[in-house]
C-alpha cells in the first residue's frame, strides 16, 4: 500500500518495527513538501536481508524521474549498499520511498527506522539554467528566492531579467555619439531602446558604426533575438545584428529613429555609432573693405553662422544702421540670410555743447570721424575747467568723444571765485562817512530784499549776501529770520525773498540780475539771543550767468582759527552811510535808510581776546563766541552798520591771490556804528565750510570754490 506524507518532517519505519518485518510486504511512502524545499532523508537503524544487487528485500528511494538510492543488507558490500551515515536529498519537493520484502526470510531482520525533513533550496547557488537564474542579483529566503537589478535597471515582468528604460533619448546637436546601454559592457536584457535624432529641416543625418559591433544573432534566422532597426523618413533599415557592423548610412533625412531590442538572454557587448548632420553649402562670403569675417572656414553649410566686424575705428553699416557686429547665417537652400554689410568709419558726430564753454576743432574741415580731435575750453575769466584738464577729446573707435582723464564724461566749467575783473584799490575809506564802490569791484555782492507779507502790517527789510556759485547766496541767518514779535527763529518764506546781483546803485536795478529764492536755509543752531551760528544760504530759483559784475567769492578752508589778527579785509554794503543818522532813529522810524550806491570799507581783524573783553565789559548779553570774530578800529570811525548785515568780510589770500569770504556782517554793540571801541562782529565762515557744502551738495571740484591752505 501507499502512504502519502505532506508534513515538513516525519519518521518512516518498516512494518512491525522494531520487531522483524513480515515477508512478502510492499509499502510506498510518498513525501511531498512545498515548492522551494527539498527532502532530506537519513536512517537511524537499518537491518534488511542481504542479497546480490538487493534482489530480495530492499528500500528504494526515488523521484518521479530517477532512483536516488537502493539499500539492503546489514552492511555495505561490493554488491549491496546500506545507508549508514549517508543522507539522501531529493532534487525537488517530492520523494518516494518503497520498502519490499520477498516471500521468505532465512532469519529474523528488524527492518529500518528513517527520518525525513524539508530543507530550504538555495536557488541562488544551485540554479545553473540561464533561463531560471537571476540576471543581476539573487536573494534566497526559506522557501524561495527573488531577483533584483543594478542601479539604473528595472526588473522585467519575468521577475528575473533586468532591462533598461531607454525610450526617451532625443539628440538635437549637429553631431553626436549614440551607444547601446552600458557599452562596452554587455547590454541589458529584455530591453527596447528608442533613440531619436531630430534636427532642423534642411539637415541630412549620416550614421557611422564604430569599433565593436556585437549583437546576439542566429546562424540561420536573421536577427531573431536582438537587433537594431533604423527608420529615416519613409525608409526602414535593418534589422542589424551579429559581429559585422553595417556600412556608413546616409539617411537623407533630418529626423532619424533608432530602435534597439534585446531578448531575455545572451551576453553581448553591443554597439556604438557616431552621427553627423550636413546641409547645403553656401558660397564663400565676400570680405568687406576694412572688415573681417569670423570664423574663417573652407566651406560654409546650412546653419553655419559668420560674424562680420570691422577694423578699429570702423562700424558695421547695415540698412543705414550702425552696429559693432553683424551676423549672417547659411540657410537650408544654400543662400546667406543677409547681404554682407559694409564697414563705415566711426563718426562721433557734433560734440555736445559745453555749458559756459567753447569747442575748437583741431582737425581740418571740422572732421568728427575716428581719431579727430576737439578742444573744450571755458569762458574765461569767469569759468575754469574742473581738475584743470586739457579739454582735448579724441573721437574713439566706438564713435564716442573721449578724454584721457574724464573718459566719455563732459568737462565741467566751474565758476572762478574771488577774482574780480577789476582789482580792488588799496586805500579804502569807511562805509560810515561814505566811499562809493566802482561797478565790478565786488561782483559777489548781493542785495537781499525781504518783503514779509505774512506780517501785519507787511514788513520789508534788506540785507547783503555773497554769491558762492551760480545758484547759492551766503548770508547771515538774522537777515532771513522772520522779524517776529518774539524770540523764536522762523525763516521767512522763500516767496518773500528777492536777490539782486551785479547791482551798483539801488535806484537803478535795470542792469542787475534779480532772482527769486528756491530755498531758504538757516543754520539749525542759530541763536536769536546771541546771534551764535549767524549764517544762512539762499538757493536761487535759476542759476545766474556770470560776468564782470557777477562772480562768486571763495570759501575759506575749514579752520577753527579763522582770519589772523590785524589782517585787513574789505566789506561792502548798502547800509547806513550817514554818520548823523542813529540806529535807534532808523529802528523807530518806519523808513529803511539805504545808501543808494554800494559802499565799502577796509577793516583789520581784531584779536579775539581784545574783542571779547570789550563786549564783556558792557552791561547786557554781549557774548562773543568762538564762531565769531571782530573787525574795526579802536578809535572807531570805520565800521559796518545796519543794512550791511549778511555781507561778506573778504580777505585776499596771498598764495592764490583770490578773495575769500572769512566773515559775514552779524552784529555790533549798543553804541552807534563806528563808535570808539565798538568793533563789528562777524560770523566766522571757516567754522561752517563743511555745513555749507553739505547744504549745497558738495561739488566734484570743491577746491575750485574754496581756497585750500
Amino acid at each position: 500500500h501507499t502512504v502519502e506524507l505532506n508534513n515538513m518532517f516525519g519518521q518512516i519505519q518498516s512494518p512491525g518495527y522494531p520487531d522483524s518485518y513480515p515477508s512478502d510486504s510492499e509499502v510506498t511512502w510518498n513525501i511531498t513538501v512545498p515548492e522551494g524545499f527539498r527532502i532530506k532523508l537519513y536512517f537511524m537503524h537499518f537491518n534488511l536481508e542481504s542479497s546480490y544487487l538487493c534482489e530480495y528485500d530492499y528500500v528504494k528511494v526515488e523521484t518521479e524521474e530517477q532512483v536516488l538510492a537502493t539499500f539492503c543488507g546489514r552492511e555495505t558490500t561490493d554488491t549491496e549498499q546500506t545507508p549508514g551515515q549517508e543522507v539522501v536529498f531529493s532534487p525537488g519537493s517530492f520523494m518516494s520511498i518503497t520498502f519490499r520484502s520477498d516471500f521468505s526470510n532465512e532469519e529474523r531482520f528488524t527492518g529500518f527506522d528513517a527520518h525525513y525533513m524539508a530543507v530550504d533550496v538555495d536557488e541562488c547557488t544551485e540554479r545553473e539554467d540561464e533561463e531560471l537564474s537571476c540576471d543581476h542579483y539573487c536573494h534566497n529566503y526559506i522557501g524561495g528566492y527573488y531577483c533584483s537589478c543594478r542601479f539604473g535597471y528595472l526588473l522585467h515582468t519575468d521577475n528575473r531579467t533586468c532591462r533598461v528604460e531607454c525610450s526617451d533619448n532625443v539628440y538635437t546637436q549637429r553631431t553626436g555619439v549614440i551607444t547601446s546601454p552600458d557599452f562596452p559592457n554587455p547590454y541589458p536584457k529584455s530591453s527596447e531602446c528608442f533613440y531619436t535624432i531630430e534636427l532642423e529641416e534642411g539637415f541630412m543625418v549620416s550614421l557611422q558604426f564604430e569599433d565593436i559591433f556585437d549583437i546576439e544573432d542566429h546562424p540561420e534566422v536573421p536577427c531573431p533575438y536582438d537587433y537594431i532597426k533604423i527608420k529615416a523618413g519613409p525608409k526602414v533599415l535593418g534589422p542589424f545584428c551579429g559581429e559585422k557592423a553595417p556600412e556608413p548610412i546616409n539617411t537623407e533625412s533630418h529626423s532619424v529613429q533608432i530602435l534597439f531590442r534585446s531578448d531575455n538572454s545572451g551576453e553581448n557587448q553591443g554597439w556604438r555609432l557616431s552621427y553627423r548632420a550636413t546641409g547645403n553649402e553656401c558660397p564663400d562670403p565676400e570680405l568687406p573693405v576694412h572688415g573681417k569675417i569670423e570664423p574663417l572656414q573652407a566651406t560654409y553649410s546650412f546653419k553655419d553662422q559668420v560674424l562680420i566686424s570691422c577694423d578699429t575705428g570702423y562700424k558695421v553699416l547695415k540698412d543705414n544702421v550702425e552696429m559693432d557686429t553683424f551676423q549672417i547665417e547659411c540657410l537650408k537652400d544654400g543662400t546667406w540670410s543677409n547681404r554682407i554689410p559694409t564697414c563705415k568709419i566711426a563718426d562721433c558726430g557734433a560734440p555736445a555743447e559745453l555749458k559756459h564753454g567753447l569747442i575748437t576743432f583741431s582737425t581740418r574741415n571740422n572732421l568728427t570721424t575716428y581719431k579727430s580731435e576737439i578742444q573744450y575750453s571755458c569762458q574765461q575769466p569767469y569759468y575754469k575747467m574742473l581738475h584743470n584738464i586739457t579739454g582735448v577729446y579724441t573721437c574713439s573707435a566706438q564713435g564716442v568723444w573721449m578724454n584721457e582723464v574724464l573718459g566719455r564724461s563732459q568737462p565741467t566749467c566751474l565758476p572762478v571765485c574771488g577774482q574780480p575783473s577789476r582789482s580792488l584799490p588799496n586805500l579804502v575809506k569807511r562805509i560810515i562817512g561814505g566811499r562809493n564802490a566802482e561797478p565790478g569791484l565786488f561782483p559777489w555782492q548781493a542785495l537781499i530784499v525781504v518783503e514779509d507779507t505774512s506780517r501785519v502790517p507787511n514788513d520789508k527789510w534788506f540785507g547783503s549776501g555773497a554769491l558762492l556759485s551760480e545758484s547759492w547766496i551766503l548770508t547771515a541767518a538774522h537777515v532771513l529770520r522772520s522779524q517776529r514779535r518774539d524770540n523764536t527763529v522762523t525763516p521767512v518764506s522763500k516767496e518773500h525773498v528777492t536777490v539782486y546781483l551785479g547791482l551798483h546803485d539801488v535806484r537803478d536795478k535795470s542792469g542787475a540780475v534779480n532772482s527769486s529764492a528756491a530755498q531758504v536755509v538757516l543754520h539749525p543752531d542759530f541763536n536769536i539771543q546771541n546771534y551764535n551760528h549767524d549764517i544762512a544760504l539762499v538757493q536761487l530759483r535759476e542759476p545766474v550767468p556770470l560776468g564782470p559784475h557777477v562772480m562768486p567769492i571763495c570759501l575759506p578752508s575749514p579752520e577753527p582759527e579763522g582770519p589772523e589778527p590785524h589782517m585787513l579785509g574789505l566789506v561792502a554794503g548798502w547800509g547806513i552811510s550817514n554818520p548823523n543818522v542813529t540806529v535807534d532813529e532808523i529802528i523807530s522810524s518806519g523808513t529803511r535808510t539805504l545808501s543808494d550806491v554800494l559802499q565799502y570799507v577796509k577793516l583789520p581783524v581784531v584779536p579775539y581776546a581784545e574783542c571779547k573783553t570789550s563786549y564783556e565789559s558792557r552791561s547786557g548779553n554781549y557774548s562773543v563766541t568762538e564762531n565769531m570774530f571782530c573787525a574795526g578800529y579802536y578809535e572807531g570811525g570805520k565800521d559796518t552798520c545796519l543794512g550791511d548785515s549778511g555781507g561778506a568780510f573778504v580777505i585776499l589770500d596771498d598764495l592764490s591771490q583770490r578773495w575769500v569770504a572769512q566773515g559775514l556782517v552779524s552784529w555790533g554793540g549798543p553804541e552807534e556804528c563806528g563808535s570808539k571801541q565798538v568793533y563789528g562782529v562777524y560770523t566766522k565762515v571757516s567754522n561752517y565750510v563743511d555745513w555749507l557744502w553739505e547744504q549745497m551738495g558738495s561739488p566734484q571740484g570743491l577746491g575750485d570754490l574754496q581756497v585750500e591752505r
Partner: antibody
Framework: QVQLKQSGPELVKPGASVKLSCKAS????????INWVKQRPGQGLEWIGW????????KYNDKFKDKATLTVDTSSNTAYMDLHSLTSEDSAVYFC???????WGQGTLVAVSS | DIVMTQSPSSLAVSAGEKVTMTCKSS????????????LAWYQQKPGQSPKLLIY???TRESGVPDRFTGSGSGTDFSLTISSVQAEDLAVYYC????????FGGGTKLEIK
C-alpha cells in the same frame, strides 16, 4: 478777512478727554504759528503752547506739557488741542490766536463736572 | 521762567484822565542783537477775546488809537492811556515773548 473760528462749548466728566478745534481762514495758514491760551473764570491769561503748521513744530508751557497736545490739519486749515485727564481745574475758556496774536478766536468754554 | 508782575491790580479813573499802569519782568527782555524789547500789551473787554495793543514794548498795532502808548526797556515797562474813554473799560495784560510767553496778572481799569 482773517478769522479764527473755535468749536462750541464742552461739558465733560472728570478723567475724560476733549478735543477743541480752531479753524483759520483769510490768510495762508502755514505762514504763522497758532497759540493757545487758557483763562479760568475771573482769572488772568495763561499761555499753553504754540504749533507751527509749516513743519508741525510745537512748544509748550511746562505746566501744560502733560495736559495738552497740539496738532494741525493743513488740508482743512484747522488747529486742534487735546486736553487729557480733565479735572475741575481745567474748567476754563480756551482761546486760540494767530499772526502773532493779531487775531483771536472767540474762545471755547470747557466745563468739567460729574 | 520769566515772571511778569503788573501793578496796580485795579484802578478807577474818570473819562478824559491820563492813566499809567506798569509791568515788571524778572529778567531783561531786551535782545541786544535785534535791539528790541520783547514785551506786548493786551486789552480784554468783558466777555471778549484779548486784543493786541502794543508789541516790542512801544510799537502800536495797526488800528489802535494813538492815546495808547507803550514805553520802557530791559525790565520796566508801562502802558499809558493819555485820555481814558468809556470804551477803555477792560483788563490790561502785559506779556513777555523773550523766552516763550508769560502773561502778567492783569490791571483792571474801571471808569468812575
Amino acid at each position: 478777512q482773517v478769522q479764527l473760528k473755535q468749536s462750541g462749548p464742552e461739558l465733560v466728566k472728570p478723567g475724560a478727554s476733549v478735543k477743541l478745534s480752531c479753524k483759520a481762514s483769510g490768510y495762508t495758514f502755514t505762514t504763522d504759528d497758532i497759540n493757545w491760551v487758557k483763562q479760568r473764570p475771573g482769572q488772568g491769561l495763561e499761555w499753553i503752547g504754540w504749533i507751527y503748521p509749516r513743519d508741525d513744530r510745537t512748544k509748550y508751557n511746562d505746566k501744560f506739557k502733560d495736559k495738552a497736545t497740539l496738532t494741525v490739519d493743513t488740508s482743512s486749515n484747522t488747529a486742534y488741542m487735546d486736553l487729557h485727564s480733565l479735572t475741575s481745574e481745567d474748567s476754563a475758556v480756551y482761546f486760540c490766536s494767530s499772526l502773532e496774536d493779531t487775531y483771536w478766536g472767540q474762545g471755547t468754554l470747557v466745563a468739567v463736572s460729574s | 521762567d520769566i515772571v511778569m508782575t503788573q501793578s496796580p491790580s485795579s484802578l478807577a479813573v474818570s473819562a478824559g484822565e491820563k492813566v499809567t499802569m506798569t509791568c515788571k519782568s524778572s529778567q531783561s527782555l531786551l535782545n541786544s542783537r535785534t535791539r528790541k524789547n520783547y514785551l506786548a500789551w493786551y486789552q480784554q473787554k468783558p466777555g471778549q477775546s484779548p486784543k493786541l495793543l502794543i508789541y516790542w514794548a512801544s510799537t502800536r498795532e495797526s488800528g489802535v488809537p494813538d492815546r495808547f502808548t507803550g514805553s520802557g526797556s530791559g525790565t520796566d515797562f508801562s502802558l499809558t492811556i493819555s485820555s481814558v474813554q468809556a470804551e477803555d473799560l477792560a483788563v490790561y495784560y502785559c506779556k513777555q515773548s523773550y523766552n516763550l510767553y508769560t502773561f502778567g496778572g492783569g490791571t483792571k481799569l474801571e471808569i468812575k
